[in-house]
């Protein structure tokens, strides 16, 4: 059996339903059997566990995804395999084996695999702050959200108005979330905002940042 | 060699039922998906059922779905077609074909000619 | 349902002319296509599976392409025994379709 599946990697939002298609041909024979089995991000392929069985007729969802998963077509026995999986939550990201068996059909091993990735959108990132912030000193601002997909981006904004800083003070990383301020002044001194951004939407923390000069204690 | 030999073809009435066999020799008849194909005079070929194997999944198109009903004798190497609710439409030689490995249509009968008309 | 489109629907030749016959799928079948010849009074014969594949027995003047949506049967060298009705029919998913049909006559 020659299974096709998409070649691109398919996304899904969080929360809505997934249709991983999944298409083959052959003469279905009473011997016809169709399984999907899920890999977890990172792991071989051996290592995968079924979620949905069709064989003799009848359809056996598996495992901790069984209340979700379900067929486009029931039976599975046009030449359509399309698994839907309902309300989609981050630990369903992964890789999604699709394997048909027609005997006598054994002109190709009859699998196909479609990687998964459930679209989240960047939850409220943590601000903090760790270096010297006297007059002189360098600070680094860090930004971070625990939950993502793809990962966020971080952007690093100074709220109100101040003197442009020269060049070079100020470095950001977008992909770290860091942002790393030198050479700081009491101008420096402000808040500080954090954007984590990615194609499902955004979030932001603050961070006040205050300047001493040397002889004073670190207030942040 | 392969033979389909397909019968009980003929005229009925819009709304009248017909049974259609094919009786199957030279070949493993039970390891085989079977399909009925039609062809109305003067035009194309339409496939309209087929049956796989042991006779556990059938397959119509939605022009034939609910109206005709395909099955299977292995023990008799023999296919049929049962056609209720006959149309004008349904008017075509019937042809009982063998399916390959892949759902093409490897060995056909001769046919048999189904007439619906009052 | 994918719908079989065959051109030409008529085409006139000679024996010892090359033949090309045209399908095309509504969407893409990859390779799941299947030629047939018919003559007159008499049951299909199948001519060409999976695009390209001859069965035992087919004369090797015929020939198949094509993948996705595009298809061709070609005659290299049309024989007094060619002159009949062709057609295309795709073997993907259900349900399974045919073009209308070419048919090849005599010039």
């Known amino acids: 059996v020659e299974v096709k599946v998409p070649t691109e990697p398919l996304s899904t939002p969080l929360g809505k339903t997934a249709e991983l298609t999944c298409t083959y041909s052959t003469s279905v024979g009473d011997s016809f059997a169709l399984e999907w089995s899920f890999v977890q991000p990172g792991k071989p392929i051996s290592e995968s566990h079924p979620i949905l069985y069709f064989t003799n007729g009848h359809l056996y969802p598996t495992g901790s995804k069984s209340k979700r998963v379900s067929l486009l077509q029931n039976p599975p026995t046009v030449g359509v395999a399309t698994l839907k999986l309902t309300d989609v939550h981050p630990s369903d990201t992964g890789t999604y084996l699709c394997q048909v068996n027609n005997p006598p059909d054994f002109y190709t091993n009859g699998l196909g695999l479609i990687n998964l990735t459930v679209l989240v959108p960047p939850s409220n990132p943590l601000c903090s702050q760790s270096g010297q912030t006297s007059v002189g000193g360098s600070t680094a601002l860090r930004c971070s959200s625990s939950e993502g997909a793809p990962k966020p981006v971080y952007n690093w904004v100074r709220l109100g108005t101040f003197p442009t800083p020269s060049p070079g003070s100020m470095v950001q990383d977008e992909v770290s979330g860091q942002l790393i301020l030198t050479n700081l002044s009491l101008t420096s001194s402000g808040t500080y905002r954090c954007v984590a951004t990615n194609q499902m939407g955004s979030a932001s923390c603050e961070l006040t940042l205050s300047v001493t000069e040397p002889s004073q204690g670190r207030v942040a | 060699q392969v033979q389909l030999v397909e019968s009980g073809g003929g005229l009925v009435k819009p709304g009248g039922s017909l049974r259609l066999s094919c009786a199957a020799s030279?070949?493993?008849?039970?390891?085989?998906?079977m399909s009925w194909i039609r062809q109305a005079p003067g035009k194309g070929l339409e496939w309209v059922a087929s049956i796989s194997d042991g006779g556990l999944y059938t397959h119509y198109p939605d022009s034939v779905k609910g109206r005709f009903t395909i099955s299977r004798d292995n023990a008799k190497s023999s296919l049929y077609l049962q056609m209720n609710s006959l149309r004008a439409e349904d008017t075509a030689v019937y042809y009982c074909a063998r399916q390959g490995v892949r759902p093409f249509f490897d060995y056909w009968g001769q046919g048999t000619l189904v007439t619906v008309s009052s | 349902d994918i719908q079989m489109t065959q051109s030409p629907s008529t085409l006139s030749a000679s024996v010892g002319d090359r033949v090309t016959i045209t399908c095309r799928a509504s969407e893409n079948i990859y390779s799941y296509l299947a030629w047939y010849q018919q003559k007159p009074g008499k049951a299909p014969k199948l001519l060409i599976y999976n695009a390209e594949t001859l069965p035992e027995g087919v004369p090797s003047r015929f020939s198949g392409s094509g993948s996705g949506t595009e298809f061709t049967l070609t005659i290299s060298s049309l024989q007094p025994d060619d002159f009949a009705t062709y057609y295309c029919q795709h073997h993907y998913v259900i349900p399974w379709t045919f073009g209308q049909g070419t048919k090849v006559e005599i010039k």
């Open positions: 030279g070949f493993t008849f039970s390891n085989s998906g």
